[in-house]
Structures are given as structure tokens and as C-alpha cells.
């Protein structure tokens, strides 16, 4: 009886794993084996596919074959018993185009109100992604184990920290990789769960802000308790994208080690031009807080995006505010060569109720004020460019009294 050649051959490639699956053409014939040949582009001869010779099942693995993953390859299969079937040729394919990204490896660390996620490609030193290793981005789905309500987080890198979680709560997540340059979306990792710790005695510092004063950077933060010492560390932001060995060498800012105030001042020349991450930790001598949320700090923008300088002309029911260029040391105005938008906050001196005006113009009217009342004003600048979504710190507050009634003309 003539053997029929196998049909419906499927090639599955996940990372560096090359798997072939096919259907038997004749289930009634026993003890049949299957063999594959392959042919590279531009070659006439067929070569035996190692790992896929005399296979008794309908699946084989040819991962050991060292292929150029960008080169087209053709496969053929036949059935063998006493005689052989005719060859069945599989449509030619390029391994890289066909390949799927496998599930990444995930490692979790828990704090009281945060989880640190370390992600690395599922296949170490992958041949398939050798040229794309630095281009991986990841996305994840996270949920509270008790509720199942999912939150998606896109475009993260090999280390990501999720804040504002609840203590002593189990969170579960799964992660997948993507190579946006090749339009490839990977397979989700298995689900990983971790429980956040009991609430720490000391909370982390909050609301970290960097401003420029003269030739110095001023770093300020808020803290709940007094009589604490703080330390500040920095890291090159690009290292977060680097899927290297997951050792992030945060460095101390010398002038911000063991400071006893909620601010520290250090020279601008501590940092070369670049983008950095900053974090702050508090300690009372016995206990140490977890690190604060990391803030991004761009020296280029920080150096130029200074708080606006303004003058106020007071009327009985309004203020006219004239915004000028900020001053550098030596009283020289800074040239801001990108469009800015101004946020003006004002409040009655005796009240905490703040009102806000957002304005592109440099002359702004603050309306509906009461006569003979002291109002305070502060302002900050924002870049209008979406890619450089940066803000200056607020200027110092300026307080003025409105004029008596009927002076609005």
C-alpha cells in the first residue's frame, strides 16, 4: 500500500524554540515514522533536519539547528515505513517573522504599599532577539487577589515599581513583552502573586521637587514627622531601560546624605547633562522608611524651566499680573525658547481656599476680588510640548492688598 504524505504542517516558533506539528494522513497504518529536510534560500540541495528524523510522534523540535533567523527556509516532510511517501513541501518562511515572543521571567519584591517588578526575557541570550534585546518593552495586568478588578499598565521597562497599594494585601499580575519595532506582541507570563507587607512605622518622603537657585539645585520634600534624617540617591534614567543584570547602582548625592531638614542644596555641577531618577529615604535612627516614589529629573529642562517672575497691579476687584522672564544669578533674564503655559494660584490671605487660572498670555487678570483684602499669588510655568511635559516649581508667593471700592477703572 502506498504511504500518503503527512498534511497540515504547522511551524511554531517561540523565542529560540522551533516546534513542528503535523497530521498523520493515514491513522490506520501503524509504526510509521516521519522525517524532515530543510533547504535554505538560494540552495538546490535538501539537508536532513536534525532532531526531526524518524520521529514516531507528530511533533518534533529543531531548536538545535543553528539557523540565520533572518533567512528564508523551506521544509519538506515524508512518512516512512517499509517504503516512503512522497515529500510534502511546507510554505517557505523566515524564522524571525514567524517567531513569537515567549513569556518573560518575572521577579517580585514587596514593600508595604508598593511592589517592585523585575522583568527579563524568558530566554537568556536569545538568538532570535539578539539584535532586539534592548528594544523590549513590557505591559502588565495587575489585580487585587480579592477583587479581580484588573488594571493595565503599558510600556514599562525591565524594572517597574507600582505605588499606592494597600498593606497586607495580595496582588497578582502577569506580564508580556513586545517588540514594537517588529510589531510583535508576546505571550503572557504565568500569574505571579505577592502579598504587601505590614504597614511600615515610617512612611516614605513625599512630593519631591527640584528647583534651581543660583548655581545650585534645591531638592525639597514633605515628611510627616520631625527629628528625622534623610538621604537622597540618584540613578541614570536610561539604566531602567537596560535589561542587564538587575543591579541598579543608585548613588548618594554627597550633600544630601544624613540631612536633618526636608531639603538639601547641591551644586549643579554634581550632574552632567542628562535625565536622572531621584529618590529619598527617611530614618529616625532605629527605623528606616522605604524609598520615596522616584522622580524624573532632566538637567536640561530643570536648568531652563525656572519659576516665572511677575508684577502685580492691584485694583479694587481684581489684580493685573504681568509675567516676565525668570532671572538667573547676576539678574540676567533667562531666554525661554519654547512655548510656555502659566498656572496662577491665588487665595485670600486669611483662607486656605485656592483658586487657579491657566493662561498662555503673559498679562493675566485675576477677577472677582474683594476690596481692601489681602490676596496671595504664586505662579509656575509648564512646557506646552507634550513630549517635554515639564513644570517649573512655584514661585514664592507675593501678597498684595486690593484697593478700596470704585477704583476698577
Amino acid at each position: 500500500k502506498n504511504l500518503k504524505s503527512p498534511q497540515k504542517v504547522e511551524v511554531d516558533i517561540i523565542d529560540d524554540n522551533f516546534i513542528l506539528r503535523w497530521n498523520r494522513s493515514d491513522e490506520s497504518v501503524g509504526n510509521v515514522t516521519f522525517s524532515f529536510d530543510y533547504q535554505k534560500t538560494g540552495m538546490d540541495n535538501w539537508i536532513k533536519l536534525s532532531g526531526c528524523q524518524n520521529i514516531t510522534s507528530t511533533k518534533c523540535n529543531f531548536s538545535s539547528l543553528k539557523l540565520n533567523v533572518y533567512e528564508e527556509i523551506k521544509l519538506r516532510i515524508r512518512a516512512e515505513k517499509e517504503n516512503t511517501s512522497s515529500w510534502y513541501e511546507v510554505d517557505s518562511f523566515t524564522p524571525f517573522r514567524k517567531a513569537q515572543i515567549g513569556p518573560p521571567e518575572v521577579h517580585l519584591e514587596a514593600e508595604d504599599k508598593a511592589i517592585v517588578i523585575h522583568i527579563s526575557p524568558g530566554t537568556k541570550d536569545s538568538v532570535m532577539w539578539a539584535l532586539d534585546g534592548l528594544s523590549f518593552t513590557y505591559s502588565l495586568v495587575i489585580w487585587k487577589n480579592s477583587s479581580g478588578v484588573e488594571e493595565r499598565i503599558e510600556n514599562i521597562y525591565s524594572r517597574h515599581k507600582i505605588y499606592k497599594l494597600s498593606p497586607e494585601t495580595t496582588y497578582c499580575l502577569k506580564v508580556k513583552a513586545a517588540l514594537l519595532t517588529s510589531w510583535k506582541i508576546g505571550v503572557y507570563s504565568p500569574v505571579h502573586c505577592i502579598k504587601t507587607t505590614v504597614e511600615n512605622e515610617l512612611p516614605p518622603p513625599e512630593n519631591i521637587e527640584v528647583s534651581v537657585q543660583n548655581q545650585n539645585y534645591v531638592l525639597k520634600w514633605d515628611y510627616t514627622y520631625a527629628n528625622m534624617t534623610f538621604q537622597v540617591q540618584w540613578l541614570h534614567a536610561f539604566l531602567k531601560r537596560n535589561p542587564g543584570n538587575h543591579l541598579y547602582k543608585w548613588k548618594q548625592i554627597p550633600d544630601c546624605e544624613n540631612v536633618k531638614t526636608t531639603q538639601c542644596v547641591f551644586p549643579q555641577n554634581v550632574f552632567q547633562k542628562g535625565i536622572y531618577l531621584l529618590r529619598v529615604q527617611a530614618s529616625d535612627g532605629n527605623n528606616t522608611s522605604f524609598w520615596s516614589e522616584e522622580i524624573k529629573f532632566d538637567t536640561e529642562i530643570q536648568a531652563f524651566l525656572l519659576p516665572p517672575v511677575f508684577n502685580i497691579r492691584s485694583l479694587s476687584d481684581s489684580f493685573h499680573i504681568y509675567i516676565g522672564a525668570p532671572k538667573q544669578s547676576g539678574n540676567t533674564p533667562v531666554i525661554q525658547d519654547y512655548p510656555l503655559i502659566y498656572e496662577i494660584i491665588f487665595w485670600e490671605n486669611t483662607s486656605n481656599a485656592e483658586r487657579k487660572i491657566i493662561e498662555k498670555k503673559t498679562d493675566v487678570t485675576v477677577p472677582n476680588l474683594k476690596p481692601l483684602t489681602v490676596y496671595c499669588v504664586k505662579a509656575r510655568a509648564h512646557t506646552m510640548d507634550e513630549k517635554l511635559n515639564k513644570s517649573s516649581v512655584f514661585s514664592d508667593a507675593v501678597c498684595e492688598k486690593t484697593k478700596p471700592g470704585n477704583t476698577s477703572k
Epitope: E109, E111, D112, H118, N200, E201, L247
Partner: antibody, heavy 118, light 107 residues
């Protein structure tokens, strides 16, 4: 294969100094931190300090500040621990270890025994 | 400094038993705890990192758990080669510290 090879046993006189070495193979020490740990006979482990061989930045346990000096030479892939003003208290085994972020101390040297005796 | 307390200096167990070695920290260290095994005359051998992750090559009868201030190393189906001292280690904040050790004896 990743390995940390420590220098041989030392016999030194009280008041003298000693410099121990720890050479990495199978990896580049500047990509990691190298830590030093002290262990008295039949006793627990005590953390001495660590170095970032990339830039020489060090951290020490307060009790070893002034007693221990950690240095590194990336060209020979070696970290060093120098101990000064030795006393009988320093007759112990010293270990170096590679620190790898959340993997902690994932590789250790075989240890160097230091005996302080006149 | 963060104090690591391994309250049991010695533990006696039999082959095939399950044993729990505990470690308490003086403050919350998240999950920044590792466990090491040390046999006489040898350097410490890494077992567990980040509280619950096994180093490659470590048998799966070794399991780590806990978080915050309470940590446990569980050895299920104890083998005679598990006779050793076990140390916990915190790497949350400097100075890094170790527990005093728990010596596991096989009956």
C-alpha cells in the same frame, strides 16, 4: 563559570596590617558590588562593607570604619580588604561575596583565614 | 542597625521530617531577605533570595516564606546532607546584617 578566588591564609603580628584579595572569574566585577564578611570560629557572620568596583564607592558597617579599607582594581578583576592595627579579635575567616541586586550575595569566595599572633 | 534574630540556635530533626527555621527582623525589610547554608569548613552556600526565590540548583525541598519582619526557611523531607548551619541575611538597608545562625542536627 562564575567564581571568586580568595588569597591564601595569613599569619600576622599584633598591630600589623594585612591585605586580602578576592579575584573574580567568569564575570566582570565592575558590573556588581563586592562585599566582605567576617566569621569568627564557630560563630555567626558579620558584614564588614562593600565596594562598587566601577567607581570605588564604599560602604562600611560602623564597627569596621577605620579598621577595614576596601579597594578594587578592575584591570585585574580583583577586590581587596585591608585590615589595620590587628589584634587577636581579628583572628577569623574573611569571605568575599558578589552582590547581585535582589539576588543578594549569589557567589562567595572560599574564605581566607587570618591568624594574629606574636 | 537592623537586628536579625534567629531564636533557635540548635534544632534537632530526623531524616524525612519537615523543619522550620525562623528569623525575625527588628524592622520592616520588605522581602529583602536571603538564606544561606554553611557546612563545617565551607563557605556559605546561597539557598534563597528575596524571601522565597530558590537559587538555581537548590533542591525544591527548601522553601522560603514571610515578609516584613517575620521570615521562615522550611526544609521538607530533611536529608542527612542538610546537616548544616542556616543564616538569614537582610539586604534592605546598610549596614547589612545576618542572623546568629541555626544549627540543624540530624538525630
Amino acid at each position: 563559570e562564575v567564581q571568586l578566588q580568595q588569597s591564601g591564609a595569613e599569619l600576622v603580628k599584633p598591630g600589623a596590617s594585612v591585605k586580602l584579595s578576592c579575584t573574580g572569574s567568569g564575570f566582570n566585577i565592575k558590573d556588581y558590588y563586592i562585599h566582605w564578611v567576617k566569621q569568627r570560629t564557630e560563630q555567626g557572620l558579620e558584614w564588614i562593607g562593600r565596594i562598587d568596583p566601577e567607581d570605588g564607592e564604599t560602604k562600611y558597617a560602623p564597627k569596621f570604619q577605620g579598621k577595614a579599607t576596601i579597594t578594587a582594581d578592575t584591570s585585574s578583576n580583583t577586590a581587596y580588604l585591608q585590615l589595620s592595627s590587628l589584634t587577636s579579635e581579628d583572628t577569623v575567616v574573611y569571605y568575599c561575596g558578589r552582590y547581585h541586586g535582589y539576588w543578594a550575595l549569589d557567589y562567595w569566595g572560599q574564605g581566607t583565614s587570618v591568624t594574629v599572633s606574636s | 542597625d537592623i537586628v536579625m534574630t534567629q531564636s533557635q540556635k540548635f534544632m534537632s530533626t530526623s531524616v524525612g521530617d519537615r523543619v522550620s527555621v525562623t528569623c525575625k527582623t527588628s524592622q520592616n525589610v520588605g522581602t529583602n531577605v536571603a538564606w544561606y547554608q554553611q557546612k563545617p569548613g565551607q563557605s556559605p552556600k546561597p539557598l534563597i533570595y528575596s524571601t522565597s526565590y530558590r537559587y538555581s540548583g537548590v533542591p525544591d525541598r527548601f522553601t522560603g516564606s514571610g515578609s516584613g519582619t517575620d521570615f521562615t526557611l522550611i526544609i521538607s523531607n530533611v536529608q542527612s546532607e542538610d546537616l548544616a548551619e542556616y543564616f538569614c541575611h537582610q539586604y534592605f538597608s546598610y549596614p547589612y546584617t545576618f542572623g546568629g545562625g541555626t544549627l540543624l542536627e540530624i538525630k
